[in-house]
């Protein structure tokens, strides 16, 4: 499956996005930081078949997708700038579930994805309880906004690779 | 009864690499991630890797990364961890660890064996 | 990497004696801060889960609270058997880390 050259600029436009949303200062937030545990190992594309690096290309978008759909979310972030943000991550996700469809059909999905998947689910839940213990503060949603760009950027490099590969 | 018995430990010398097994019964090992934790003779716990229960979801302690391959055979119930490079600083206990979810992360180490110790020296 | 604090590093305490051994994190863990206990020559054994949920087959006497970066491991009334060494342990994020462990010595 071939991702449409629109998904890449749609990826970069989210990011832009995202980067835009930013209302206060990183450097205020600093007593706020916080280690998430991103999965990078998940993201570094070299053990996956193309069928797995697309499922969990997938459910990164889904669950930044939802995190980013909940009202504590609305109330946090410029309404514009968040809808084309959620618009640009619902575009993705279209582009990614055909991908899905075509791929599944070509190689079966190992079970080891099954592992990537929950990993990226934990993941966000210890977001959510992030935000949950700082009481959807302004600094603790601006440290996730600094969270989901780093992210993203490790899925738009995963996805340039995927593309090489083709 | 639930078990988990290490095997492979032994005498190595520095730069010498080692294979540990782990061989796992009384639980339905495909279910349960497996991690290797470590302790030197005297001294505390280190972590050292871990394996979703699929095989996929590898993780490292940043002391081994690049010299330690973890990985598992469900059909078999056997945990392994492949090392290499093995220093002075690798000598201690390697226990195999069953944790409580199906891969690392927000949970608990709930089953141990009972170690193999692994001595680097010249 | 989240470091793992504990103390005291060693106690000693009479039997019957109520003992509480300390555990803090350097960022917040939420509630997945796990406690260890190790007899001598023995491998390590589960006894507190999540910070305060007690493993089947461990003694009453032992609870856990807390939740962020404060942990504590209560022994209410400290018994014989309870010699050992203690260990708290991150599990909210890998690399999963230990505390240094406590020494618990019967008097």
């Known amino acids: 499956c071939d991702l449409p050259q629109t998904h890449s600029l749609g990826n970069r436009r989210a990011l832009i996005l995202l980067a835009q949303m930013g209302r206060i200062s990183h450097f205020s937030c600093l007593k706020d930081r916080h280690d998430f545990g991103f999965p990078e190992e998940e993201f570094d594309g070299h053990q996956f078949q193309k069928a797995q690096a697309i499922s969990v290309l997938h459910e990164m978008i889904q669950q930044t997708f939802n995190l980013f759909s909940t009202e504590d979310s609305s109330a946090a972030w410029e309404q514009s700038l968040l809808e084309k943000f959620s618009t640009e991550l619902y575009q993705q996700l279209n582009d990614l579930e055909a991908c899905v469809i075509q791929e599944v059909g070509v190689e079966e999905t190992p079970l080891m994805n099954e592992d990537s998947i929950l990993a990226v689910r934990k993941y966000f839940q210890r977001i959510t309880l992030y935000l949950t213990e700082k009481k959807y503060s302004p600094c603790a949603w601006e440290v996730v906004r600094a969270e989901i760009m780093r992210s993203l950027s490790f899925s738009t490099n995963l996805q340039k690779r995927l593309r090489r590969k083709d | 009864e639930m078990q988990l018995m290490e095997s492979g430990g032994g005498l190595v010398q520095p730069g010498g690499s080692l294979r540990l097994s782990c061989v796992a019964s009384g639980f339905t090992f495909k279910s349960f991630a497996m991690s290797w934790v470590r302790q030197a003779p005297g001294k505390g716990l280190e972590w050292v890797a871990s394996?979703?229960?699929?095989?996929?979801?590898?993780y490292y302690a940043p002391s081994v990364k690049g010299r330690f391959s973890i990985s598992r055979d469900n059909s078999n119930n056997t945990l392994y961890v492949q090392m290499n490079s093995l220093g002075v600083e690798d000598t201690a206990f390697y226990y195999c660890?069953?944790?409580?979810?199906?891969?690392?992360?927000?949970?608990?180490?709930?089953?141990w064996g009972q170690g193999t110790l692994v001595i680097v020296s010249t | 990497d989240i470091r793992v604090t504990q103390s005291p590093s060693s106690l000693s305490a009479s039997v019957g004696d109520r003992v509480s051994i300390s555990c803090q994190t350097s960022?917040?863990?939420?509630?997945?801060l796990n406690w260890y206990q190790q007899r001598p020559g023995k491998g390590p054994q589960l006894l507190i889960s999540a910070a305060s949920t007690l493993q089947s087959g461990v003694p009453s006497r032992f609870s856990g609270s807390g939740s962020g970066t404060d942990f504590i491991l209560t022994i209410i009334s400290l018994q014989p058997e309870d010699s050992a060494s203690y260990y708290c342990?991150?599990?909210?994020?890998?690399?999963?880390?230990f505390g240094q462990g406590t020494k618990v010595e019967i008097k």
């Open positions: 394996v979703g229960s699929q095989g996929g979801s590898k």
């Open positions: 342990q991150q599990g909210y994020i890998t690399p999963y880390t």
């Open positions: 960022q917040s863990v939420n509630i997945y």
């Open positions: 660890v069953k944790e409580t979810d199906a891969v690392a992360t927000m949970d608990a180490l709930d089953m």
